[in-house]
């Protein structure tokens, strides 16, 4: 078998047939078949190889593991548990690998895992204990710092009879294991709402990406506890207006940058407070790009250029005067 590659390049290994549980012990830093390994970069790439399982014989040195573009379908409990454990594994990318089921304890025995990317997998069945590993009310803290869950919503016909938002949030909150999470990306998931308790229980967040969802309102969402939050991406949602409570909370976050582009802002009398706030605040990035979508007469008007006289509401007619 060929040795692992030097610092400068990746090399495909020869087929490796001895597993950690087979008759002869594996050579400690052998590269699995169908993978490319760089010991110098502490990186293993098993990319676009139609793998149906996680390779059993990953080299102990692996710090960065790419298993993208495969056909894994299911991650069982202990999918990465090895003897000896993969103690150095810090970054794991499983994006685009046709995962639809991630079981409780799938990432157990990875003591250094800081970055996990499950994006572009149709996760119809994400266990509440996928990240916490146990069903205890308070689990051992997860080492995860970055969790990338962009476009994990399954096709509508494959969704279970439960809230997809609820399933994801349950996994984020189980056992309070993700208290140290700093980056959470949940873009492109068709989220209609954000459960009100989720942000309060992720106090270390620096970066939250909720872009390209279907969020209509942030009325019941509290950002107050997210004192470390540096970026909040809300582009490409269905937001109509931000109300006073939300505006005040965002203004109170010391390091925040908010991204609000491409929302269908409704420029009526309810928008007055937000327009006033936009004119004063420095937290909104590209605020000069925000435009009205409704009502028709206000379409494409720049929010920053509006004044109170522009923002009227049609009077609500008493029932006796309404027409059908």
């Amino acid at each position: 078998s060929s040795p692992t590659s030097s610092a400068s390049s990746f090399s495909s290994s020869a087929p490796f047939l001895a597993s950690a549980v087979s008759a002869q012990p594996p050579l400690p830093d052998q590269c699995p078949a169908l993978c490319e390994c760089s010991e110098a970069a502490r990186t293993v790439k098993c990319v676009n190889r139609n793998l149906t399982e996680v390779p059993t014989d990953l080299p102990a040195y692996v710090r960065n593991l790419f298993l993208t573009g495969n056909q894994l379908a299911v991650l069982p409990a202990g999918a990465f548990a090895r003897r000896p454990p993969l103690a150095e594994l810090a970054a794991l990318n499983l994006s685009g690998s046709r995962l639809d089921e991630v079981r409780a304890g799938a990432f157990e025995h990875l003591p250094s895992l800081r970055q996990l990317d499950l994006s572009h997998n149709p996760l119809a069945d994400l266990s509440p204990f996928a990240f916490s590993g146990s069903n205890a009310s308070v689990s051992a803290p997860s080492p995860l710092v970055e969790l990338i869950l962009n476009h994990i919503v399954p096709p509508e016909d494959e969704r279970q009879n439960r809230s997809f938002e609820g399933m994801v949030v349950a996994a984020l909150l189980a056992g309070r294991a993700l208290q140290g999470l700093r980056r959470l990306e949940l873009a492109s998931n068709h989220f209609l709402y954000l459960p009100r308790d989720v942000l309060a229980q992720l106090p270390s967040l620096r970066h939250l990406d909720l872009s390209n969802n279907s969020l209509v309102s942030l009325t019941y969402v509290s950002f107050r506890n997210l004192t470390h939050l540096e970026s909040l991406h809300l582009e490409d949602n269905a937001l109509k207006v931000l109300h006073n409570g939300t505006l005040a909370e965002l203004q109170g976050l010391p390091h925040i940058r908010v991204f609000l582009d491409n929302n269908p802002w409704v420029c009526d009398c309810h928008m007055a407070d937000m327009v006033t706030w936009l004119k004063e605040t420095e937290v909104v990035q590209g605020k000069d790009r925000l435009t009205c979508a409704y009502p028709e007469k206000m379409r494409n008007r720049v929010l920053l250029e509006l004044n109170s006289a522009d923002l009227d509401c049609d009077p609500i007619l008493p029932p006796s005067l309404q027409t059908s």
């Epitope: 399982e53 379908a73 299911v74 119809a124």
Partner: antibody
């Protein structure tokens, strides 16, 4: 037509070794995971070992772990089972079987089996 | 390990009559995405053959008098009208985790 043909069975003394082969034809061998399953005389079926299509994953039953090694040569369309330190309880008909994946898969094609007898 | 328990261990059925075999797993072998339970028939002197995969899906070429149902821990294989060629030993098997395990088998005889 999918065909799996096992060979290499025989009578062997305890502690000795044997290598089984399974020749595959009628399908793209390199696209499928493969199993060995055994059946002791008059008994039921027991899963023995699995190897993924590209030899990246290997799994064994506890009863054979450390003694048996599963391997494959996709260029020869052949699956192997190296059996060392054989015991009387390894006596069985050994079947090779095809699957599309380990957990989401099932044994959708079987060979006729080869008989291994471990006896002094 | 997951233990698969089949009942009955043997049954004798008159041709044309229905038959039913039960399989119980010691823990759930279903997720909301997939059911990890499969059925096989081993005819006398032959290797096993796949009948039903994922609890209820009929394998290609298997007569439609065979059907499977169940989820979680309890599963059933039914033969709507037994024929002489159906004799043999029926096995259920899970693929939830390693090790894969089979039921102990149910022997079907013709009266």
């Amino acid at each position: 037509e999918v065909q799996l043909v096992e060979s290499g069975g025989g009578v062997v003394q305890p502690g000795r070794s044997l290598r089984l082969s399974c020749a595959a034809s009628g399908f793209t061998f390199s696209n499928f995971g493969m199993h060995w399953v055994r059946q002791a005389p008059g008994k039921g079926l027991e899963w023995v070992a699995y190897i993924s299509s590209g030899s990246t994953s290997f799994y064994y039953a506890d009863t054979v772990k450390g003694r048996f090694t599963i391997s494959r040569d996709n260029s020869k369309n052949t699956l192997y089972l190296q059996m060392n330190s054989l015991r009387a309880e390894d006596t069985a008909v050994y079947y090779c079987s095809r699957t599309n994946s380990l957990l989401r898969g099932f044994f959708d094609a079987w060979g006729q089996g080869t008989t291994v007898t471990v006896s002094s | 390990d997951i233990v698969m328990t089949q009942t009955p261990l043997s049954l004798s059925v008159t041709p044309g009559q229905p038959a039913s075999i039960s399989c119980r797993a010691s823990q759930s072998v279903s997720s909301s995405s997939y059911t990890y339970l499969h059925w096989y028939l081993q005819k006398p002197g032959q290797p096993p053959q796949l009948l039903i995969y994922s609890a209820s899906n009929l394998e290609s070429g298997v007569p439609d008098r065979f059907s499977g149902s169940g989820s979680g821990t309890d599963f059933t294989l039914k033969i709507s009208r037994v024929e002489a060629e159906d004799v043999g030993v029926y096995y259920c098997q899970h693929s939830w985790e390693i090790p894969l395990t089979f039921g102990q088998g149910t022997k079907l005889e013709i009266k």
